[in-house]
């Protein structure tokens, strides 16, 4: 058993049929010694008396808010949550496996630049009685500070018969050094509580590996005289790190016909313009990637050819 | 070349070669990011590699003030990785195919380090740890980890040379 926060405790249980459970001793936070009784949740049934209460925690029915009283007055509360371990593996019932980039990916994180700011998100099908708390640091043995905001519901989607809820959080490294080569990864820890179930999820990454630039901006076409060719030009996204002579991007320009089956013409360039042939009903798209480190490509910025 | 006493290197040549290094480092092992290295007794085996840190003057402001600190750090790293790529970790079993990009990567590391430091002048170099794995799978694990950290190192070096070529070239 360990304290999650003031008056909230997590009981770690090996979860299998007829498991013996865990013996827990609760102590009433009061100077009083006599006439103390204990109840669980809204029930008025007295579970025991005295300054301490010993319980055997085996299942969710044994978890909840234990309250000690004296003469009708509440003295203190202890909320017990359960953390299940099945076959030596902690349960992951609350969050959905996003399976990208690999199985058992519950948290996904992205950064738009090297400033030390990043966003993480996760998915669940649970709509109520759900709370999240996020902590982060750079490194684990001698952690350096990362400040995370509160997790918020950022999207709702319908997937078949189910509703899926996306939560996200923004974090900022306290003393970021955008030009340095990271040697210690960022660690993100998410505590999830659904009713009386506790679970924790972690992710470890370097900012360089989660970089995904915003799409190029101000994508424009300039027809070239007496030619089917056009000059496509664009700019670095506003959110990308500066100076651009240092934090350089590379670009992929694609000409795509109306039909998905049509052959795509692709050009790669380090410049912010390119000359391509504009076909009728086609569109021109441009995306960006860090020039020197193969992290994710941005989403496409597109304009129609006509 | 970075001549002793602090005159400028051939920024444009260094830019071109460092960008080539980036390409080679990724072609040597593009899958490296998707390998599940954790289950292989993933004790930190590449902690001793030289990293370009915050105080090394490799940021745009530090380069403007005095690029020599940063260039020395980059040179140190290039020599370190060049030695690693020439060691038993990469020459031992399982052997790399003759057309593996590791050979080109090794030669390019040497080429860039020589551009930075002419014959006859010696910046101090970092000692290379004696990592001689007893098991072939450990050698593979080390290769992946070394290539992974090399990718990060050469990315910073390439940014330095690109910025230098754009803003510091005479």
């Amino acid at each position: 058993i360990w304290e999650l926060k003031k008056d909230v405790y997590v009981v770690e249980l090996d979860w299998y049929p007829d498991a013996p459970g865990e013996m827990v001793v609760l102590t009433c936070d009061t100077p009083e010694e006599d006439g103390i009784t204990w109840t669980l949740d809204q029930s008025s049934e007295v579970l025991g008396s005295g300054k301490t209460l010993t319980i055997q925690v085996k299942e969710f029915g044994d978890a909840g808010q234990y309250t000690c009283h004296k003469g009708g007055e509440v003295l203190s509360h202890s909320l017990l949550l359960l953390h299940k371990k099945e076959d030596g593996i902690w349960s992951t019932d609350i969050l959905k496996d996003q399976k990208e980039p690999k199985n058992k990916t519950f948290l996904r994180c992205e950064a738009k630049n090297y400033s030390g700011r990043f966003t993480c998100w996760w998915l669940t099908t649970i709509s109520t009685d759900l709370t999240f708390s996020v902590k982060s640091s750079r490194g684990s043995s001698d952690p350096q500070g990362v400040t995370c905001g509160a997790a918020t519901l950022s999207a709702e989607r319908v997937r078949g018969d189910n509703k899926e809820y996306e939560y996200s959080v923004e974090c900022q490294e306290d003393s970021a050094c955008p030009a340095a080569e990271e040697s210690l990864p960022i660690e993100v820890m998410v505590d999830a509580v659904h009713k009386l179930k506790y679970e924790n999820y972690t992710s470890s990454f370097f900012i360089r590996d989660i970089i995904k630039p915003d799409p190029p901006k101000n994508l424009q076409l300039k027809p070239l005289k007496n030619s089917r060719q056009v000059e496509v030009s664009w700019e670095y996204p506003d959110t990308w790190s500066t100076p651009h002579s240092y934090f350089s991007l590379t670009f992929c320009v694609q000409v795509q016909g109306k039909s998905k089956r049509e052959k795509k013409d692709r050009v790669f360039t380090d410049k912010t313009s390119a000359t391509v042939i504009c076909r009728k009903n086609a569109s021109i798209s441009v995306r960006a990637q860090d020039r020197y480190y193969s992290s994710s490509w941005s989403e496409w910025a597109s304009v129609p050819c006509s | 070349r970075a001549v002793p006493g602090g005159s400028s290197p051939a920024w444009t040549q260094c830019q071109q070669l460092s960008q080539k290094l980036c390409t080679l480092a990724w072609s040597a092992h593009p899958l490296v990011g998707h390998m599940d290295l954790r289950e292989e007794g993933d004790e930190e085996t590449t902690n001793d590699v030289p990293h370009i840190q915050c105080g090394d003057g490799c940021d745009p402001q530090g380069l403007r003030d005095n690029s020599q600190f940063c260039l020395q750090r980059i040179h140190q790293g290039l020599i370190f990785y060049e030695k690693l790529l020439g060691s038993d970790i990469f020459t031992g079993e399982p052997s790399l195919l003759p057309d593996s990009p590791v050979g080109q990567l090794h030669a390019s590391l040497l080429g860039l380090s020589q551009l930075l430091q002419p014959e006859g002048h010696h910046w101090e170099t970092q000692q290379i740890p004696s990592l001689s794995p007893s098991q072939p799978w450990q050698r593979l694990l080390l290769r992946f980890k070394i290539l992974r950290s090399l990718q990060a190192f050469v990315a910073v070096a390439a940014r330095v040379f690109a910025h230098g070529a754009a803003t510091l070239s005479p």
Partner: antibody, heavy 126, light 111 residues
Framework: QVQLVQSGAEVKKPGSSVKVSCKAS????????ITWVRQAPGQGLEWMGE????????YYNEKFKGRVTITADKSTSTAYMELSSLRSEDTAMYYC???????????????????WGQGTLVTVSS | DIVMTQSPDSLAVSLGERATINCKAS???????????LHWYQQKPGQPPKLIYN??KLESGVPDRFSGSGSGTDFTLTISSLQAEDVAVYYC?????????FGGGTKVEIK
């Protein structure tokens, strides 16, 4: 075509040594390793060790506690396996095999004992 | 050392029937979660062994009635339809860790 030709059968006294040769042809000797495997009469296979001429690395089965020495002569494309302090339980068929052990981007681990010698019967008897 | 345990020791199967050979390692012999360092060899009487399955790949020239599966510590070689020429002893070999080790062998016969 690839061939591994081993030296002839040997009868040895306990405590003595035996040196078995394995002459390779039909491929670039230095590009592959040579593995030695033995098989006692009616028994299974036992890996003794292997040598890679290109890297100069040799791997041994510690079970033989320094009794086995594996070498290769690149100039004659011949590999050798010497076993000393022979005892009766060393009576076995000794095989050499070509070892291809490579790493690529797509398949990080490829190991094949793809061509074998005909075997050399070593009998240890007093 | 990694101990390789093969089962059964011997197996009698009718022609055209399926034969399944198991190999269990005392330690994981997959690398990076997926790549297998487990190989299968076939040995016919009076001959040296012959490689039939390399990691997760059937060697060229080996009939596709042979298939290998498994990861971690448990591996299986299956002959989907046994032919007379498949009568042999089959060995698994791990080369994740030196010393490389063979299983004890499984003798496949016709019932």
């Amino acid at each position: 075509q690839v061939q591994l030709v081993q030296s002839g059968a040997e009868v040895k006294k306990p405590g003595s040594s035996v040196k078995v040769s394995c002459k390779a042809s039909g491929y670039t000797f230095a590009s592959y390793g040579i593995t030695w495997v033995r098989q006692a009469p009616g028994q299974g296979l036992e890996w003794m060790g292997e040598n890679y001429p290109r890297s100069g690395n040799t791997y041994y089965n510690e079970k033989f506690k320094g009794r086995v020495t594996i070498t290769a002569d690149k100039s004659t494309s011949t590999a050798y396996m010497e076993l000393s302090s022979l005892r009766s339980e060393d009576t076995a068929m000794y095989y050499c095999a070509r070892a291809e052990f490579i790493s690529t981007v797509v398949a990080p681990y490829y190991y094949a004992l793809d061509y074998w010698g005909q075997g050399t019967l070593v009998t240890v008897s007093s | 050392d990694i101990v390789m345990t093969q089962s059964p020791d011997s197996l009698a199967v009718s022609l055209g029937e399926r034969a399944t050979i198991n190999c269990k390692a005392s330690k994981k012999v997959t690398i990076f979660g997926s790549t297998s360092a487990l190989h299968w060899y076939q040995q016919k009487p009076g001959q040296p062994p012959k490689l039939i399955y390399n990691g997760a790949k059937l060697e060229s020239g080996v009939p596709d009635r042979f298939s290998g599966s498994g990861s971690g510590t448990d591996f299986t070689l299956t002959i989907s339809s046994l032919q007379a020429e498949d009568v042999a002893v089959y060995y698994c070999l791990q080369n994740k860790e030196v010393p490389y080790t063979f299983g004890g062998g499984t003798k496949v016969e016709i019932k």
